[in-house]
């Protein structure tokens, strides 16, 4: 019986010769747990593991800690890959994070962090980022230094309020901070002056809820 080939991320899938965009099964080394992830094999040389996508409001992102831990949604559409998988993956080697954004006027922008990882669940999946470049703002819209992850049932933010309940969605909230890509999805012409929308302040300013977002990771030096 031949040994089954497994891939830890989309970069490994790409290097194995699978260079078509789509959903692939990923497995961490020394683990039997599988996740389904969308692989972008075209953008910027390919090999990108999509860890979050918003595009049409079809999936509810106001989820529990456990749901954000294991992931939810549809990898071909709107989804969250899962904090536990991303934490384990990004602590095995160095990863870059690219965040691609779309507004309702047909514009696109990105933020690229040269080093990204999440702490363990015991440390509330705190986000760690370094080295920002890109067109979606010269200042990071994810508060620096990174915050713990919060959900509607796990209040780990720095606010006297409960940011996840107030703004909806799980995120690395500060109090509450310049971004929330897991906020409420608002359609065109209803997407301004929103207190709980899909926010990336240093690109579109306050209250503007975006049309689309993608968070993707790839090993540094790919």
């Amino acid at each position: 019986k031949g040994e089954q080939i497994s891939f830890r991320d989309c970069a490994e899938v790409f290097k194995s010769g699978h260079t078509t965009n789509g959903v692939y099964t990923l497995t961490l080394p020394n683990s039997t747990e599988e996740v389904k992830a969308y692989c972008d094999m075209e953008a910027g040389g390919g090999g990108w593991t999509i860890i979050q996508r918003r595009e049409d409001g079809s999936v509810d992102f106001q989820r529990t800690w456990k749901e954000y831990k294991v992931g939810f949604g549809n990898p071909s559409g709107e989804y969250w890959l899962g904090n536990e998988f991303v934490s384990q993956l990004t602590n095995q080697q160095r990863y870059v994070l690219k965040i691609h954004l779309k507004d309702w006027e047909g514009n696109e922008a990105y933020s690229l962090y040269e080093h990204f990882y999440l702490s363990s669940e015991e440390l509330n999946y705190r986000i760690h980022l370094k080295g920002l470049t890109g067109t979606a703002g010269k200042i990071s819209s994810i508060s620096q230094p990174g915050n713990d992850f919060s959900t509607k049932d796990a209040d780990n933010d720095k606010c006297i309020c409960k940011c996840s309940q107030m703004l909806t969605g799980g995120w690395w909230f500060d109090a509450c901070g310049p971004s929330n890509l897991n906020g409420m999805y608002y359609p065109q012409r209803q997407n301004t002056n929103k207190f709980n929308g899909i926010k990336w302040y240093y690109w579109k300013g306050s209250g503007y809820s975006l049309k689309g977002t993608t968070m993707m990771i790839r090993p540094a030096g790919f």
Partner: nanobody, 129 residues
Framework: EVQLVESGGGLVQPGGSLRLSCAVS????????IGWFRQAPGKEREGVSA????????YYADSVKGRFTISSDNSKNTVYLQMNSLRPEDTAVYYC??????????????????????WGQGTLVTVSS
Amino acid sequence: EVQLVESGGGLVQPGGSLRLSCAVSGITLDDYAIGWFRQAPGKEREGVSAIRSSGGSTYYADSVKGRFTISSDNSKNTVYLQMNSLRPEDTAVYYCAAVPAGRLRYGEQWYPIYEYDAWGQGTLVTVSS
């Protein structure tokens, strides 16, 4: 839908006064803080003053302390900025904006500009002789 509409701007001589109004709809002032911001040509938007109606707390930038007074009329859902002893450097477009009152960092009293998610279109204040 949240809306903020500023009015009261205009041309005034140095040393003169103006009262700006911010009419708010779609939210109640009891639950929100309202801030006044200004943006002069070629400069970044800066905070001028803010008020939390629920507790009566107010904030003023150092540059306007003693000259500007912020107040609110909850029955009219309107916030006012009384501007006295105006100077040429006060010339700018003035905006009002809203933030949920509870969106405060532990130990802080006021809010960074990025927490204000609802904005008006602005009213122009020109101080010139």
